[in-house]
């Protein structure tokens, strides 16, 4: 997260870190005791999932292995459409005040809605600085029409844009798959942005979760 702030401790109990060994690979969101939602471009053979802590590599955090993941069948590595994936945990999460599932959206929130995005991604760009604490940024949803002025035909129908006019605050490498939460519901998963990160008026781009609720529910049901 560029130009963000340290999240209030425990305020994001659904936030998970997908680790490759002990190293951050991507963010993710707990949606069920067995399931984590993340970006399709975060796909790996297996994952170490850290839950219940705002500190990356926290020894006291829950760590659960995951060996199965299900990318959206329409995901394209070229255009990054349908950048969404479900990761099935090998064992169920122990829910607590520090570990909770996020609420999936009932509807798509409108442009102008205030949201918070979080992650352990780099706080500087192009040179990288990975924080140990979970970082947050407050952004607003931007209409597709406005966002297309910047990204033209690169913006797919199920991509969502967010940012703050003239501000550098944005997502970056390592934040991928993490949550954009608006009015206590999951509206976006961090997908991509311009590089170097934090260029004013280049919105962050997210997968619009409200358009995938049916796929999420059906995939979890199929692979119970």
């Amino acid at each position: 997260i560029i130009d963000g702030y340290k999240c209030k401790e425990g305020s994001h109990p659904w936030q998970v870190a997908l680790l490759k060994g002990n190293q951050l690979h991507c963010g993710g969101v707990l949606v069920d005791k067995y399931w984590v939602l993340t970006a399709a471009h975060c796909k790996m053979g297996q994952y170490q999932v850290q839950l219940g802590s705002d500190k990356i590599g926290d020894q006291s955090a829950q760590k659960i292995k995951a060996t199965k993941s299900f990318r959206h069948p329409g995901y394209s590595t070229k255009t990054h459409v349908n950048d969404i994936m479900l990761v099935r945990l090998d064992e169920p999460v122990k829910m607590s005040s520090k570990v909770e599932a996020v609420q999936l959206p009932e509807h798509c929130e409108p442009p102008g809605t205030s949201c918070t995005v979080s992650g352990w991604g780099t706080t500087t760009s192009p040179d990288v600085t990975f924080p140990s604490d979970l970082m947050c940024s407050d952004v607003k949803l931007i209409s597709s029409r406005e966002c297309k002025k910047v990204y033209k035909d690169l913006l797919g129908k199920t991509m969502l844009c967010a940012g703050i006019p003239d501000s550098k605050t944005n997502t970056c490498n390592g934040d991928s798959g993490g949550p954009l939460v608006c009015n206590d519901t999951l509206q976006g998963l961090v997908s991509w942005g311009t590089y170097p990160c934090g260029q004013p008026n280049d919105p962050g781009v997210y997968t619009q979760v409200c358009k995938y609720k049916r796929w999420v529910m059906e995939t979890m049901k199929t692979h119970r």
Partner: antibody, heavy 128, light 107 residues
């Protein structure tokens, strides 16, 4: 394979404008900055500026500010460089070159591997 | 603006000899953002070295780069006939600057 193909040679009169195109193929056009470099006869390489094809954001060398315009059309994977108010000392070979990443995806940081792909060059002659 | 100064302007050597080309920056350059290019008459530049010391794909191991801060070096361990050309250093972070070039000619 990855390549950049530029438009053909141009002969222009002083005061006119020239627009050079650079068509990319073999890679995701929007994923990398496009830079423009020129080389006057018998001289070294001179950087003119760059465009981020994803956002259209430009960076121009101070020397060319106000005279150069870089644009792109992502639907046809093509970048353009227009130079106005041409003078005889603008006679040069103009190159497009693929630069560093213009977008980020994924978890890790990027390594920029240098300008690994260049166009064949477009000769622009300014003469009355 | 970072100014890159290359020396010597011309290097006269025979095939088989070692060539050492210098590039000095007016202020510190991150070694992650320094590259070397080779250019032959009538051709576009060709990337040799990026990140000060990493060889680009397909570049023979007789080419090596070193240095940090303000002083960088390109070394060609044994000159082959096809190596006689002009060499440019470049910094890219994110605006580009090129050095004036060093011509390596046959003695």
């Amino acid at each position: 394979q990855v390549q950049l193909v530029q438009s053909g040679a141009e002969v222009k009169k002083p005061g006119a404008s020239v627009k050079v195109s650079c068509k990319a193929s073999g890679y995701t056009f929007a994923g990398y900055d496009m830079h423009w470099v020129r080389q006057a006869p018998g001289q070294g390489l001179e950087w003119m500026g760059s465009i981020n094809p994803t956002s259209g954001r430009t960076n121009y060398a101070q020397k060319f500010q106000g005279r150069v315009t870089m644009t792109r059309d992502t639907s046809i994977s093509t970048a353009y460089m227009e130079l106005s108010r041409l003078r005889s000392d603008d006679t040069a070979v103009y190159y497009c070159a693929r630069g560093g990443p213009s977008t980020w995806y994924g978890g890790s940081a990027y390594t920029y591997y240098g300008a690994d792909v260049w166009g064949q060059g477009t000769t622009v002659t300014v003469s009355s | 603006e970072i100014v890159l100064t290359q020396s010597p302007g011309t290097l006269s050597l025979s095939p088989g000899e070692r060539a050492t080309l210098s590039c000095r920056a007016s202020q510190s350059v991150s070694s992650d953002y320094l590259a070397w290019y080779q250019q032959k008459p009538g051709q576009a530049p060709r990337l040799l070295i990026y990140g000060a010391s990493s060889r680009a794909t397909g570049i023979p191991d007789r080419f090596s780069g070193s240095g940090s801060g303000t002083d960088f070096t390109l070394t060609i361990s044994r000159l082959e006939p096809e190596d006689f050309a002009v060499y440019y250093c470049q910094q890219y972070a994110p605006l580009w600057t090129f050095g004036g070039g060093t011509k390596v000619e046959i003695k």
